[in-house]
């Protein structure tokens, strides 16, 4: 027979030879990191047809790392289903808890013993320090010193000293989230007031108001014979300016050869007339109020 078979889990006892006589026996032992559990044979014999009798390394089992329990408020998950060396043990914490330590341990072989690569981690409750205080505003639960996971606070603005109210810019409600950080930055309370939007040769068709504060939205259309240059809809943004800027109504060219510029808001049409029925509370054309505003 030629050289006997090789295995992942067991190795030949003694030096291998290039050839073996019929009837000659070779013995195997479990490799380092493996241990033998009977009754499977760990030897083979050179048969008279010059082949080795069947043998396997299934009696050699990998050394195993000690069992690790789930951490309190968490879970230990074996990546490949056993505690044998080479195994990975993944740790996750329950919602509302965070991991202190390594989230993966490896079952490693030290000499002939399988041991874990480190200490199992802990799962600690997620806690947040109080959220930021803000100028001209306050948040709920201002007396609380420690917040737990998903605890929420709501910000509100103080009454303004002048005629215009403070607007809350940002998220009014934030919560204690992962990494012990708040879900959003604290909002800001400030007076946001946009100028009255004047459109020559046009008119406002929605969003009428005494004053235009944060997020106020206004829509326009142009008089007959004029087209909208810009957006028909503008919003009062946190820097007290309209975005996009207040549009202009430009005269439609009367020359038959010249193409009128088109509104960026309304596509290739010389005038932009949104259907008035889209704007609740705005009079319908048949009420005779919208006609001839110029």
């Amino acid at each position: 027979c030629e050289a006997p078979p090789t295995f992942e889990a067991m190795e030949l006892i003694g030096k291998p030879k290039p050839y073996y006589r019929v009837g000659e026996r070779v013995d195997y032992k479990c490799k380092k990191g493996y241990f033998y559990i009977p009754p499977l044979a760990t030897h083979t014999i050179c048969d008279r047809n010059h082949t080795w009798l069947p043998v396997s390394d299934e009696g050699c089992y990998r050394e195993m790392c000690p069992h690790i329990r789930d951490p309190l408020n968490g879970e230990a998950i074996l990546a490949n289903g056993s505690y044998e060396f080479g195994a990975e043990l993944h740790f996750i914490c329950n919602e509302g808890y965070y991991l202190i330590g390594k989230d993966i341990l490896y079952c490693e072989l030290k000499d002939t013993v399988a041991i874990w690569s480190g200490k199992p981690p802990l799962c600690e409750k997620i806690l947040c320090t109080p959220p930021p205080k803000i100028k001209n505003g306050k948040h709920t639960f201002s007396e609380v010193e420690v917040f737990e996971y998903l605890d929420a606070v709501t910000y509100s603005c103080d009454p303004a000293p002048g005629p215009d109210p403070f607007s809350l810019i940002g998220e009014s409600m934030i919560y204690c989230g992962n990494n012990s950080t708040w879900s959003h930055a604290a909002p800001e309370c400030k007076v946001v007031k946009c100028r009255f939007p004047v459109v020559e040769n046009g008119k406002q068709i929605s969003g009428f108001g005494k004053k235009f504060y944060y997020k106020a939205t206004v829509m326009f259309e142009c008089d007959k014979g004029y087209y909208l240059n810009g957006s028909d809809k503008i919003v009062c943004e946190s820097n007290s300016t309209w975005d996009p800027p207040v549009p202009k109504c430009l005269k439609v060219s009367t020359s038959p050869t010249t193409k009128s510029p088109t509104s960026s808001a309304s596509g290739p049409r010389p005038t932009y007339k949104p259907p008035v029925s889209n704007y609740p509370g705005y009079p319908k054309p048949d009420e005779g109020i919208l006609n001839n505003l110029d």
Epitope: K193, C194, R195, F196, N201, F208, E287, N292
Partner: antibody, heavy 118, light 107 residues
Framework: EVQLVESGGGLVQPGGSLRLSCAAS????????ISWIRQSPSRGLEWLGV???????NYNSAFMSRFTISRDDSKNTAYLQMNSLKTEDTAVYYC????????????WGQGTLVTVSS | AIQLTQSPSSLSASVGDRVTITCRAS??????LNWYLQKPGQSPQLLIY???SLHSGVPDRFSGSGSGTDFTLKISRVEAEDVGVYYC?????????FGQGTKVEIK
């Protein structure tokens, strides 16, 4: 609080020109939107136009060809240039600070009288 | 341009009377209407903006109402110092225009 004072009024012949001034004290004229309004017994109150803080202007189209509003920040003064004056332009002319960007007029000066007569 | 028509053109009231002045717009103007009072020998002064908001320092006997095309200025108990000419003004559309005025006298 800014004070606006009109000047430059007087007697002018029909067809003539006149430039009215609106001087700001206690504040910068460029920080406010300034409107010109006139008042006469025959025509009542008439809004003539406005110059915005960004230097843009809007006019009453009835006067657009003859009246021009401008501003000289170095002199802290707004102006109303009136050309081709007619007898019906006889009126008291007010420069008026637009209220905080909104078209209501809360800061009237004493006005300056312009008389167009031959 | 949008025309504003005030009525009556003049009225005479006794001190303590309730006075009502109306302003009608030739087109729909939402609530974009202001009221002014010009006392004898003085420049106009703002009383009410955006139909019903009292300007600072204006006594609360003045009130405004209305919407669309019809607007009203009321003086609940007129006083001697309320004499003068009252004007309405629209600002929904350029040119901004004024009513012709209503003269209020005290009997």
């Amino acid at each position: 609080e800014v004070q606006l004072v009109e000047s430059g009024g007087g007697l002018v012949q029909p067809g003539g020109s006149l430039r009215l001034s609106c001087a700001a004290s206690g504040g910068s004229v460029s920080s406010y939107d300034i409107s010109w309004i006139r008042q006469s017994p025959s025509r009542g109150l008439e809004w003539l136009g406005v110059i915005w803080t960004d230097g843009g202007t809007n006019y009453n189209s009835a006067f657009m060809s003859r009246f021009t509003i401008s501003r000289d920040d170095s002199k802290n003064t707004a102006y109303l240039q009136m050309n081709s004056l007619k007898t019906e332009d006889t009126a008291v002319y007010y420069c008026e600070r637009v209220y905080d960007g909104y078209p209501w007029f809360a800061y009237w000066g004493q006005g300056t009288l312009v008389t167009v007569s031959s | 341009a949008i025309q504003l028509t005030q009525s009556p053109s003049s009225l005479s009231a006794s001190v303590g009377d309730r006075v009502t002045i109306t302003c009608r717009a030739s087109q729909w103007i939402s609530n974009y209407l202001n009221w002014y009072l010009q006392k004898p020998g003085q420049s106009p002064q703002l009383l009410i903006y955006y139909t019903s908001s009292l300007h600072s320092g204006v006594p609360d006997r003045f009130s405004g109402s209305g919407s669309g095309t019809d607007f009203t200025l009321k003086i609940s108990r007129v006083e001697a110092e309320d004499v003068g000419v009252y004007y309405c003004q629209q600002y929904i559309k350029l040119p901004w225009t004024f009513g012709q005025g209503t003269k209020v006298e005290i009997k």
